[in-house]
Interface confidence: medium
Amino acid sequence: LECYSCVQKADDGCSPHRMKTVKCGPGVDVCTEAVGAVETIHGQFSVAVRGCGSGIPGKNDRGLDLHGLLAFFQLQQCSEDRCNAKLNLTLRGLNPAGNESAYEPNGAECYSCVGLSREKCQGSMPPVVNCYNASGRVYKGCFDGNVTLTAANVTVSLPVRGCVQDETCTRDGVTGPGFTLSGSCCQGPRCNADLRNKTYFSPRIPPLVLLPPPTTAAPSTRAQNSSSTTSTAAPTTTTSIIKPTTAQASHTSPHEMDLEVIQEEGASLSGGAAGHGGTAGHGGAAGHQDRSNMEKYPGKGGAQIPAKGGS
């Protein structure tokens, strides 16, 4: 079997001229394409993977909402040569674009990472945006998390930051087959610089503080967590669709998740690796286009965020 192969990380890695073909290994009988689009009130981007897969042919579409962060996921598997180029990986431009000035800021201020690489979305590096309320929904919280897409033995992960409706969520997430959008929320100006280590303590309940014994003179030290890299190849074990076993999606790299193997609507994701040479990471961020109102995601159709009406 021969399949198209590409990786798109909020850039143009799966644009027409960058398409590769790859011969699948023995026992690999489907070509896979998966795309996940994420939209914040300040912009949108998509991640996508094409390559050799496993399982049975089928299609799986899903719209997801995480505290006002919208995600749309599509998975398509097929069994003919080079059949995995049916999904539209293009984000349709919102109408009108760049219309944020039409909305009244509600006082909340957050870091925004929309299609930015992990390097450009560290600490206080990313741009700061003013939150606003849209379609009667109040966006006064800030979010720090990741979107992760696993398909064809490749895992693509990008940071997501922006304004959300919740101000206290902790390691919350939504999942589709091989797709996870997860993270934590906070309250206060620019509070979402790094919420990876946020605990489940409510802001109204003071956390338990362990005081050192009176006899100890040495100051207490805090263990520092090193940042985990998420844009790595998936484990080489042949599994089907992955989902966190916990009720809430882990806010860590896919390798740190406890995974269970499930089969969903006839489409599974892993299989022969679709080699890609340097296609991910080029180009820069996706277009920053503002959302003026929120529409529901369609159940079917191209993997693109629907155009929004302006004011």
Partner: antibody, heavy 117, light 112 residues
Amino acid sequence: EVQLLESGGGLVQPGGSLRLSCAASGFTFSNAWMSWVRQAPGKGLEWVSYISSSGSTIYYADSVKGRFTISRDNSKNTLYLQMNSLRAEDTAVYYCAREGLWAFDYWGQGTLVTVTS
Amino acid sequence: QSVLTQPPSASGTPGQRVTISCTGSSSNIGAGYVVHWYQQLPGTAPKLLIYDNNKRPSGVPDRFSGSKSGTSASLAISGLRSEDEADYYCAAWDDRLNRPVFGGGTKLTVLG
């Protein structure tokens, strides 16, 4: 029917500027990656610049980097190429092309840019 | 000097079969990127002839076929006709240059 119509070419002195336009019709322009490709008289095709559908990702050939700027207006279905600091070697027919099925599937008729003193 | 190498000229008589080669490297054709072929008739804009190594857009006669192997690709024209007289260009993405690249072009002459 897909149509791409270039305009804005002409005669210009070295160091001068020109702005090329490409009016698109017959397809959803805002979903299409677009490129400029040029062809010097009697020579082969040379890719010049590329812009993604949203306009967020842009590439240039080394020969024009820093002098040419590609842009698009999806509301007007128009692609642009702003050419500054023009040189004699920029003399060519400039084509705008749509990227479709992994290739430039539609081309405009071209507009001639002549740089001479 | 083009990144993809094509013979500058080729010729054949009507009815003959002609093949045009396109040689690349490990950063373009050899990296797995698909190859496309364009036909440019005299005084006109280029037209897509073969895409995705061996696929024909609608309207292109099946006399035209493409193939790819390793770091090379080729365009074959069978049952040559006088209207096939044109310049032919191959193209592919190049990983190292991070852009699309063209061959230098092959001028096909139909003799007689």
